[in-house]
Interface confidence: medium
């Protein structure tokens, strides 16, 4: 299936040009998306190109500026947040990144009624997290690991927690491992629907071992960065959940929510919190051995001012073939009765589907079914359930939005997006207004991305929000590579792959092949999305064929494929890349003397193991910021898939699956190893150990470090990185510079 046919015709060839590396590094062909910032059923805010904050009313067709770019500029604001009562806006400036999601910032409160900044009782700086209540204009914020509450922006703050301490106790914000591997947010506090209560997590990292690395900066002495970071098998954070009445916060203070007994009996995690009503909350917990999850529905007891979580409202989700959930355990979407909910989990055939739970998980009603997977529940209204799946035409790398009419009998299912712009759009997400009155669809490809606004009742398109016209025009004279998504059937395993082919691809010729791999558990690389990136350039200008392959361990094709890697990372992911390469060679257009593999992070681990597989298939390869031993990576992620590194559990495979154990096998390949020295995620230690093992085995290799760079290798390092990797590959493939 050719997804993005090249627009090259002989008559046009003179005016068409190939992509250049400079195009990629400058972001010349980047695209825009439009996600409305919904503030009601029919209104949304959007930051205009000239930085005004504009309110749009879909029904009246009117728009007006609620905050001028002049006001934004007066405090150098880069972000904003309107209070639900529309009286105030917070303006965010001095953004300072911490980890993947977390950052600190300075916040100013602007009073829309009088057009002035709120003076008196200003917020401290820098703040770690700040948010409005869902109703009115109460503020909750985290400063120096403690939570504060303001009834109104100009009021003095009420301090909720007092034990916050850097790198020791975190209130309302996650520690490193919870941020990266469990919550995937910068916050750990949640307002109840009407703002009566505020729930928050407290993480105690007192006993967690600390990772320390040098940050060189430009001082005479480097700084040492210390992060409590539990590696596999190490002591984990201790988590507690509290809820405080924000109307009378001093009355009884924060009340702890009890942990289910079956969870509390050994090490455990808190995985998410979902408010149902102001007086009902749902907490999800997970055993440290992550195959048992418990969903606990708790009710406020007015007489005792406590939270009660009856055993009858505990729902257990257990996996017997792998870990609980996909990447994370799914979260519930509650129905209007405030007790039943919809949730995605594996059905009896091992496919993730939507289930409706009223009393017990055993009595769950399966809502979707088939040899495909439901991926996200966007919204449940009284009449409809909106979700995404990869059902359409049996392509796992697509995403379409569906609506099930749950208010009628028999319920009907409709694909909202399947036939809208079929060639251009096969990978969607959606954003819904209150009560799903309207929604935005954001299409990511395979054609040029487009964002549109729709009526939630009829699904009619109302208007185009962003269609990337400039990008479309800019690409008119570019020789883009061809892309195809197909599958290989090998030993009862389906291997989907994406192949990126040079513009004038000719099956009778031989091309160098580059495998790009990620391959981590529950990931997906073969997706029907638009991208003009480094590998597009390598195909367009340098004439390489690039392939991405989703092997065992990858997502959205059922549990058999997903859980195949359980407790044995580094085996089947590598095997499947190798199998695919052999199949590509059989296709006849690959030069088998010029095959390379590269990957980043988990992909760096897989590419390293593939290079060291001893197959002789690969001439060279690159590993960027690779994991080299699972003993070096975070507990929450690693143990989910590998169990514990103990003798009575899975220590043997932890030891067998290291890159270092295969040092000798790098002798006959050209290996480029790259890592940032300030990588908080996959520590530089990983590459340091690979390098040490290679030196000890007297194996030659190439390496590049990026001083003070983290796992993303951003800024000028990005340019240097891709330039360096390009030179390496061109040398490997004997391509002239």
């Amino acid at each position: 299936i050719v997804l993005r046919p090249s627009r090259v015709h002989n008559s046009e060839e003179n005016t068409m040009r190939a992509l250049t590396l400079k195009d990629i590094l400058n972001g010349t062909f980047s695209y825009k998306t439009f996600f409305p910032n919904w503030i009601s059923g029919q209104e949304y805010l959007h930051q205009s190109a000239d930085n005004n904050i504009v309110l749009y009313n879909i029904e009246t067709g009117q728009s007006y500026t609620i905050l001028s770019n002049r006001t934004m500029k007066s405090v150098n604001a880069s972000n904003y947040g309107l209070s639900p009562d529309r009286q105030f806006v917070y303006l965010e400036s001095d953004y300072s990144k911490l980890w993947r999601y977390s950052y600190t910032a300075t916040y100013y409160i602007y009073d829309l009624s009088n057009g002035e900044f709120v003076r008196g009782n200003e917020l401290p700086r820098p703040i770690q997290y700040l948010c409005w209540s869902p109703v009115g204009s109460k503020l909750a914020y985290v400063y120096q690991n403690n939570i504060y509450l303001k009834q109104r922006p100009g009021d003095p703050p009420f301090q909720i927690t007092f034990n916050g301490r850097e790198n020791k106790i975190f209130n309302g914000i996650p520690d490193w491992v919870y941020e990266e591997e469990m919550l995937a947010t910068k916050y750990a506090l949640w307002w109840s629907p009407n703002g009566k209560f505020l729930a928050y997590a407290e993480f105690n990292d007192t006993d967690i071992p600390v990772i320390a690395y040098s940050y060189y900066g430009d001082e005479q002495y480097p700084r040492t960065i210390n992060i409590p970071y539990p590696k596999a098998g190490a002591k984990n954070p201790v988590v507690r959940i509290f809820i405080i009445d924000t109307t009378y916060p001093a009355y009884v203070g924060p009340q702890e929510v009890p942990v289910p007994a079956m969870i509390a009996s050994s090490d455990y995690y808190f995985s998410w919190l979902t408010w149902v009503t102001d007086e009902r909350v749902c907490l999800q917990w997970l055993k440290r051995v992550q195959n048992v999850s418990v969903l606990s529905i708790c009710d406020f007891r007015e007489d005792w001012q406590t939270w009660d979580c009856p055993k009858t409202q505990e729902h257990i989700e257990e996996s017997r073939t792998g870990w609980a959930g996909g990447f994370f355990v799914s979260t519930p979407v509650f129905s209007y009765d405030a007790i039943s909910y919809y949730k995605i989990f594996s059905d009896k055939d091992g496919y993730k589907h939507i289930h409706y739970i009223k009393d017990t998980v055993e009595n769950a009603i399966q809502i979707t079914s088939g040899k495909w997977e439901a991926i996200n529940i966007f919204r449940v209204t009284q009449d409809s359930l909106f979700y995404s799946s990869n059902e359409f035409e049996e392509y796992p790398g697509r995403r379409n939005i569906y609506r099930i009419s749950i208010g009628s009998y028999p319920p009907s299912k409709k694909c909202v997006t399947c036939h809208l712009r079929k060639e251009r759009c096969q990978y969607y997400t959606a954003s819904f207004s209150d009560y799903a009155k309207y929604y935005a669809l954001v299409c990511y490809g395979p054609g040029i991305p487009i964002s549109t606004l729709h009526d939630g009742r009829t699904d009619q398109e109302i208007k185009i929000l962003e269609e990337n016209k400039e990008l479309e025009n800019a690409l008119k004279n570019i020789q883009l590579p061809k892309e195809e998504i197909k599958k290989l059937e090998v030993d009862e395993i389906t291997l989907w792959y994406k192949m990126i082919l040079p513009p004038q691809f000719d099956r009778s010729k031989k091309y160098p092949l580059l495998i790009q791999v990620y391959g981590g558990p529950c990931s997906q690389s073969v997706r029907s999305v638009f991208a003009v990136n480094w590998i597009s350039y390598l195909a367009s200008k340098e004439g390489m064929v690039i392939a991405l392959v989703d092997g065992r361990g990858t997502a959205f094709q059922g549990d058999k494929l997903l859980y195949a890697v359980y407790r044995k990372l580094g085996v089947y992911e590598v095997e499947d890349q190798i199998t695919a390469v052999r199949k590509f060679i059989e296709m006849g257009f690959i030069d088998e003397k010029r095959i390379a593999i590269w990957g980043w992070s988990y992909g760096g681990y897989v590419s390293s193991l593939a290079l060291a597989s001893g197959t002789g298939l690969f001439k060279c390869g690159i590993a960027v910021a690779p994991v080299s031993s699972w003993e070096y990576y975070a507990s929450v992620y690693t143990e989910r898939f590998m169990g514990l590194p103990t003798k009575d559990d899975n220590l043997e495979h932890y030891k067998n699956s290291t890159v270092m154990a295969r040092a000798e096998y790098f002798r006959n390949v050209d290996y480029l190893l790259i890592h940032g020295t300030a990588d908080d995620n996959v520590h530089f230690q990983n590459s340091a150990q690979i390098a040490k093992a290679l030196v000890n085995a007297q194996v030659d290799f190439q390496a590049m470090w990026y001083s003070d760079q983290n796992h993303g290798l951003s800024g000028l390092s990005t340019n240097h990185l891709y330039t360096h990797m390009t030179h390496f590959l061109k040398q490997c493939f004997s391509l002239s510079d």
Partner: nanobody, 118 residues
Framework: EVQLVESGGGLVQPGGSLRLSCAAS????????MGWFRQAPGKGRELVAA????????YYPDSVEGRFTISRDNAKRMVYLQMNSLRAEDTAVYYC???????????WGQGTQVTVSS
């Protein structure tokens, strides 16, 4: 939980009409799709009418389409089945039912007998 009590059954001549009522208790009533089923002697239970939570959409099998009408009053927590042009084959015990999810009726009343005979 939803408790359901039917009334309005009885003996009626062919071609006649009858209105069945179902009183519901339980706080989740307005969130439940509702239905009427019937069971004739020696036969299985058959759905004869269903209505959505809001009352905005209804369903009837071909056998009763145009003769039976289902309606609901969420404020009074009542569901009704208006049966016109009754036939002998409509004779059965009629049950009111509430669903968790549209295709899944799992709360049932005790039933009310309807007999169509001359």
């Amino acid at each position: 939980e939803v408790q359901l009590v039917e009334s309005g059954g009885g003996l009626v001549q062919p071609g006649g009409s009858l209105r069945l009522s179902c009183a519901a208790s339980g706080r989740t009533f307005s969130y439940n799709p509702m239905g009427w089923f019937r069971q004739a002697p020696g036969k299985g239970r058959e759905l004869v009418a269903a209505i959505s939570r809001t009352g905005g959409s209804t369903y009837y099998p071909d056998s009763v389409e145009g003769r039976f009408t289902i309606s609901r009053d969420n404020a009074k927590r009542m569901v009704y089945l208006q049966m016109n042009s009754l036939r002998a084959e409509d004779t059965a015990v009629y049950y009111c039912a509430a669903a968790d999810f549209p295709m899944h009726f799992n709360y049932w009343g005790q039933g009310t007998q309807v007999t169509v005979s001359s």
